[in-house]
Amino acid sequence: EDELQVIQPEKSVSVAAGESATLRCAMTSLIPVGPIMWFRGAGAGRELIYNQKEGHFPRVTTVSELTKRNNLDFSISISNITPADAGTYYCVKFRKGSPDDVEFKSGAGTELSVRAKPS
């Protein structure tokens, strides 16, 4: 059986300030069981943008219904983009663990750049 891959098809996305940004992510397998998370940045200080399990993410919506059986699409949309949202976003698969889930595989990242709002 092939190991799960995390696919972020766009290396970069450019969005005008005030618009929504769609960041695409797909898995190639339902296994292993465990949540996905989106982060900005890849280092120790990375910021949590979305957690499938829990949390407060008022500007983030999922493009598809994540709880739907056999769903492999974990794309998100971030509303009301500002220049402060620029950065590289990573879709990361975790493997269910006890007591904590364990990071399993990360996508290659999508760089979000923000254009000035059209006048």
Epitope: R46, L48, D100
Partner: antibody, heavy 117, light 108 residues
Amino acid sequence: DVQLVESGGGVVRPGESLRLSCAASGFTFSNFAMTWVRQAPGKGPEWVSLVSVTATTYYADSVKGRFTISRDNSKSTLYLQMNSLRAEDTAVYYCAKITWNNLFDYWGLGTLVTVSS
Amino acid sequence: EIVLTQSPGTLSLSPGERATLSCRASQTVGSKLAWYQQKPGQAPRLLIYDSSSRASGIPDRFSGSGSGTDFTLTISSLQSEDSAVYYCQQHNDWPPYTFGGGTKVEIK
């Protein structure tokens, strides 16, 4: 407005323990890595420890095995348990919020830890 | 561990003059260098990151440059409120995050 308020500092003897707390408000605490930075009198800042959003912990070599960083997202509070304290641990201890690109963008006012016999 | 060396230790200048502060890294940090300002009794305040990007709310008289191992913070026209100690810090992706020893800027 982002606010970070440290507490728990004081005067202790070498070998004793102390637990620092940092109460955070004005941002979604669970979404950001947090760190402790200390500054000895008349010296520059020294990074001490970091806890990531997934609770992975990192330590400076000078405190590894003696200090433990932790977070309670339900209370928006960061902690630093300091054991086997030494005179060279004497410093103002700041907690700071970390940005996605590893910058310390907000700092507390600090709490003074003095280790003296 | 990356060691950051700042020079000079102290800079004494008159209001309106240009201040040039240096930070040298013991190994390359790319552009991942930040500058902080610290006034007595206060916590450090982020000024510059990624070598040359100004943090939110920082006046444009502060500018940064450099890459690799050699970096410069320039204050184009000193004002009395710029009297402080300035620290550089490398902000690569992984700890330890190191700071320089600082440069004290005094206004005559």
